[in-house]
């Protein structure tokens, strides 16, 4: 079969580092009291720590984070008409990561 002809490459560990992830902008981040609106865009890219550590007692955690305000559009219905309003959502980007013991507290910005 085709599988027996291909040589398996060595597995590489997904190291603990920042990676681009998709973050969903939920409506409750913008307005907890009203459900009759949409948010655009519905998702954005953020940098987040992910990957494996050498043993189970440690986890890939951010050691440095940065808050990034972005402007989104809130689409509301006013007198039957869709009206766009600007809203600000604060995203959290991870700048640096480290394998830390599970009990370790998260860093403060």
């Amino acid at each position: 079969s085709l599988g027996s002809l291909t040589i398996a490459e060595p597995a590489m560990i997904a190291e603990c580092k920042t990676r681009t992830e998709v973050f969903e902008i939920s409506r409750r981040l913008i307005d907890r009291t009203n459900a009759n609106f949409l948010v655009w865009p519905p998702c954005v890219e953020v940098q987040r720590c992910s990957g494996c550590c050498n043993n189970r007692n440690v986890q890939c955690r951010p050691t440095q984070v940065q808050l990034r305000p972005v402007q989104v559009r809130k689409i509301e219905i006013v007198r039957k008409k869709p009206i766009f309003k600007k809203a600000t959502v604060t995203l959290e980007d991870h700048l640096a990561c480290k394998c830390e013991t599970v009990a370790a507290a998260r860093p403060v910005t």
């Epitope: 609106f37 509301e76 219905i77 008409k81 869709p82 766009f84």
Partner: antibody
């Protein structure tokens, strides 16, 4: 297929009341987000919006004509009716009805129009 | 209240050339609402050619495109065809005013 058709008198006298009927098919005015609007166009001029009526019976009028306009609907007959009181020669125009839809995930657009009915105001 | 001012009033373009129509809003940001464009040929009702600022209804050729920013919106016909000869109207609204039309732009063949 969505179709709309306007009907009413071709000629009215000044001070009279004009009643126009829009009969439509292919959609229902009981469906969430659906509305019917009335628009007019004097000969060789621009379009002018008159009134909208919505699925929930909300009604909106052009502020400059509001005291002369009444819009209503008969959902069972698939009709929307516009009345204009105290007609004047400046109201001579082609009158159109159009389907309009709205909603937070929709667009506020008149996506289907009737052929229009020409109304002349003269004594 | 606001006014939509279209420019130019009329436009003569050679077949295959680009036609651009501007629609300027007197107050408020055009990006706060949707803009639609309508094509009206002589003796016919208006027909929607652009909705939601830049969306094209099915059946409308892709030579028609819409855009907008700040206080103005633009309709572009990338390669004018004989059947595009018509009057074009922009339309918008705001939270208080339900529907406002521009004054229209007549597109002809040069």
């Amino acid at each position: 297929e969505v179709t709309l058709r306007e009907s009413g008198p071709a000629l009215v006298k000044p001070t009279q009341t004009l009643t126009l009927t829009c009969t439509f098919s292919g959609f229902s005015l009981s469906t969430f987000g659906m509305g019917v609007g009335w628009i007019r166009q004097p000969p060789g001029k621009a379009l002018e919006w008159l009134a909208n009526i919505w699925w929930d019976d909300d009604k909106y009028y052009n502020p400059s004509l509001k005291n002369r306009l009444t819009i209503s609907k008969d959902t069972s007959k698939n009709q929307a009716v516009l009345t204009i009181t105290n007609m004047d020669p400046v109201d001579t125009a082609t009158y159109y009805c159009a389907r309009i839809s709205t909603g937070i995930s929709s667009y506020y657009v008149m996506d289907a129009w009737g052929q229009g009915t020409t109304v002349t105001v003269s004594s | 209240d606001f006014v939509l001012t279209q420019s130019p009033d009329s436009l003569a373009v050679s077949l295959g050339e680009r036609a651009t129509i501007n629609c300027e809003r007197s107050s408020g940001d055009i990006g706060d609402t949707y803009v639609s464009w309508y094509q009206q040929k002589p003796g016919q009702p208006p027909k929607n050619v652009i909705y939601g600022n830049d969306q094209r209804p099915s059946g409308v050729p892709d030579r028609f495109s819409g855009s907008g920013s700040g206080n103005s919106a633009t309709l572009t016909i990338s390669s004018l065809q004989a059947e595009d000869v018509a009057v074009y109207f922009c339309q918008s609204y705001d939270s208080d005013i339900d529907i406002v039309f521009g004054g229209g732009t007549k597109v002809e063949i040069k």
